[in-house]
């Protein structure tokens, strides 16, 4: 349905409030260093222009594409070259190359200060003084730090953020009310950002087919009662939504997501029995709820898969007629029967099936050739099962912090060239799989754990891509999306690594560590642990554990001392000397 004015169309569909919020998110995700006030000014100018187009779709420039309008606006920023360097060269290009250029300059790890949470009273005053600016600032700060954050979902987070302040700033104990809510939003926001980053990486690095395969598997697990045709329609629509959001087309994305939620709710009888509650909610909550909805019950008496996909004489005929449709059906049928498998495992099975058919359908006796294809699945299924069992046992034995430390050592030895902050961040997140998934019964552990690990390893991949330092990381990240986790799991100690020069400054600590939160203190210790492994990759687990215990004793002692700074200086030297002598640093 072609519209004379795309900007007018989206303004009318979304409404002024959502339009302005989405344009702000789009601009902040592109120009991550620009001050808040500059973005607000640009958004207001775009909004005023959109209103003129709503009034008269034939008005000047109203027929231009959104990329042209937004790109032209971004290119008016005076300090573009001095702030962004070569990104300014994008402005010399024409659409669609200009937008592609902006997309390529999105920075997953922008050099921005950490967001420090002000005192509750200060936040409540700011909220009451100017609610609109306060909420816009939230969108801006999240969007510029998370340039791939799923924009319509960020609107949902902003709605919850507003609700938290509305409720808690009137409460008797504001802090007790507000802080847990803000913590929850922060943690959920980081998780949401990372999940969306994987979707965008799938689309951008591995293409639409890879994303569609992922979506078929996930939606078939979630909606096992839905027909294949229904799942295929949902996959097509969902792919369009995410392609748009990952491509910076946030207005179209939000509009299409709303349409998809509407369609799902209008057709829930043929999709899932679990959607009723979601579909009674307002739009933003509804879309979020659908995205998180639990798996529906599997239909009773599903026939064996072997009949259609192994025993049938028509396997090669059906495959040859429409390869992707047939593989899609295989994936749908397998996934709806296996909510206990991770999506990536299901995709590995589908890939194995595809490879077998490619080989066997060209053979003299195809049926004889592919008859045992399901036997090839067994080791693929057992590998993640065994890994999860071992790691959950280790997690239960060690607890989260020490489990993270075990992973820090493991991953630093695998890829010691990776920067210490990245190793700490990624290993800490890998370690959270324990608390997140090990509590689940067997049937839910693998989808929880392996699909979560895919999200975390994608963080490693996107951070490493910005500054590549390890061929092994590049190889695991680029060869196969679904085999990233097995690829990293299979890496052994990097024997080619030349240990890092010892630098006493790395192991110098100050009294400020005593006032840090427990989390920040853990990060300091884990940073030291990574550096220790980089200096001494051959150190045993026991030696590293003992040195870390010495470090804990040193911090504990000095934080109790009267003259903390002197204690850190003197005892720190002793600690470094003792560790050097014992480990031969």
């Amino acid at each position: 349905d072609a519209h004379k004015s795309e900007v007018a169309h989206r303004f009318k569909d979304l409404g002024e409030e959502n339009f302005k919020a989405l344009v702000l998110i789009a601009f902040a995700q592109y120009l991550q260093q620009c001050p808040f006030e500059d973005h607000v000014k640009l958004v207001n100018e775009v909004t005023e222009f959109a209103k003129t187009c709503v009034a008269d779709e034939s008005a000047e420039n109203c027929d231009k594409s959104l990329h042209t309008l937004f790109g032209d606006k971004l290119c008016t920023v005076a300090t573009l070259r001095e702030t962004y360097g070569e990104m300014a060269d994008c402005c010399a290009k024409q659409e669609p190359e200009r937008n592609e250029c902006f997309l390529q300059h999105k920075d997953d790890n922008p050099n921005l200060p950490r967001l420090v949470r002000p005192e509750v009273d200060v936040m409540c005053t700011a909220f009451h003084d100017n609610e609109e600016t306060f909420l816009k600032k939230y969108l801006y700060e999240i969007a510029r730090r998370h340039p791939y954050f799923y924009a319509p979902e960020l609107l949902f987070f902003a709605k919850r953020y507003k609700a938290a302040f509305t409720e808690c700033c009137q409460a008797a104990d504001k802090a007790a009310c507000l802080l847990p809510k803000l913590d929850e939003l922060r943690d959920e926001g980081k998780a949401s950002s990372a999940k969306q980053r994987l979707k965008c990486a799938s689309l951008q690095k591995f293409g639409e087919r890879a994303f569609k395969a992922w979506a078929v598997a996930r939606l078939s697990q979630r909606f096992p009662k839905a027909e294949f045709a229904e799942v295929s329609k949902l996959v097509t629509d969902l792919t369009k939504v995410h392609t748009e959001c990952c491509h910076g087309d946030l207005l179209e994305c939000a509009d299409d997501r709303a349409d998809l939620a509407k369609y799902i709710c209008e057709n829930q009888d043929s999709i899932s029995s679990k959607l009723k509650e979601c579909c009674e909610k307002p739009l933003l909550e509804k879309s979020h709820c659908i995205a998180e909805v639990e798996n529906d019950e599997m239909p009773a008496d599903l026939p064996s898969l072997a009949a259609d996909f192994v025993e049938s004489k028509d396997v090669c005929k059906n495959y040859a007629e429409a390869k992707d449709v047939f593989l899609g059906m295989f994936l749908y049928e397998y996934a709806r029967r296996h909510p206990d498998y991770s999506v990536v495992l299901l995709l590995r099975l589908a890939k194995t099936y595809e490879t077998t058919l490619e080989k066997c359908c060209a053979a003299a006796d195809p049926h004889e050739c592919y008859a045992k294809v399901f036997d090839e699945f067994k080791p693929l299924v057992e590998e993640p099962q065994n890994l999860i069992k071992q790691n959950c046992e280790l997690f239960e034995q060690l607890g989260e912090y020490k489990f993270q430390n075990a992973l820090l050592v493991r991953y630093t030895k695998k890829v010691p060239q990776v920067s210490t902050p990245t190793l700490v961040e990624v290993s800490r997140n890998l370690g959270k799989v324990g608390s997140k998934c090990c509590k689940h019964p067997e049937a839910k552990r693998m989808p929880c754990a392996e699909d979560y690990l895919s999200v975390v390893l994608n963080q490693l991949c996107v951070l490493h891509e910005k500054t590549p330092v390890s061929d092994r990381v590049t190889k695991c990240c680029t060869e196969s999306l679904v085999n990233r986790r097995p690829c990293f799991s299979a890496l052994e100690v990097d024997e080619t690594y030349v240990p890092k020069e010892f630098n006493a400054e790395t192991f110098t600590f100050h009294a400020d560590i005593c006032t840090l939160s427990e989390k920040e203190r853990q990060i300091k210790k884990q940073t030291a642990l990574v550096e220790l492994v980089k200096h001494k990759p051959k150190a045993t687990k026991e030696q590293l554990k003992a040195v870390m215990d010495d470090f804990a004793a040193f911090v504990e002692k000095c934080c109790k001392a009267d003259d903390k700074e002197t204690c850190f200086a003197e005892e720190g030297k002793k600690l470094v000397a003792a560790s050097q002598a014992a480990l031969g640093l």
Epitope: Q543, D550, K574, A582
Partner: nanobody, 124 residues
Framework: QLQLVESGGGLVQAGDSLRLSCAAS????????MGWFRQAPGKELEFVAR????????YYADSVKGRFTASRDNAKSTVYLQMNSLKPEDTAVYYC?????????????????WGQGTQVTVSS
């Protein structure tokens, strides 16, 4: 499991010296820090000294600093506490303990395996 056996306690005059030993058998000795604690009659268990896994790093309670020296010999799976310039207030049962996997380094709760203790009495 780890067995720890202290020896070397006794009755001495104020100003004298004693050397306590703690011999370990069982679980790996050299992987963990060792601690010395003491308990005077009617008092709480009190931290005295910690010697790290390699024997190169020691921490002491303020009350014994400069007078006591903790050391270890990993080849012999033994930890020592050399006590000089003893005072009557040093009278207590002395225990050696092996560090656990968590908890404070200066608190009994952070130590997993314990000896049976050896009595030290300092008369004035």
């Amino acid at each position: 499991q780890l067995q720890l056996v202290e020896s070397g306690g006794g009755l001495v005059q104020a100003g004298d010296s004693l050397r306590l030993s703690c011999a370990a058998s069982g679980r790996t000795f050299s992987d963990y820090a060792m601690g010395w604690f003491r308990q005077a009659p009617g008092k709480e268990l009190e931290f005295v000294a910690r010697v790290n896994w390699s024997g190169l790093l020691t921490y002491y309670a303020d009350s014994v600093k400069g007078r006591f020296t903790a050391s270890r010999d990993n080849a012999k799976s033994t930890v020592y506490l050399q006590m000089n310039s003893l005072k009557p207030e040093d009278t207590a049962v002395y225990y050696c303990a092996q560090r656990g996997d968590s908890g404070s380094n200066f608190d009994p709760s952070g130590y997993r395996y314990w000896g049976q203790g050896t009595q030290v009495t300092v008369s004035s």
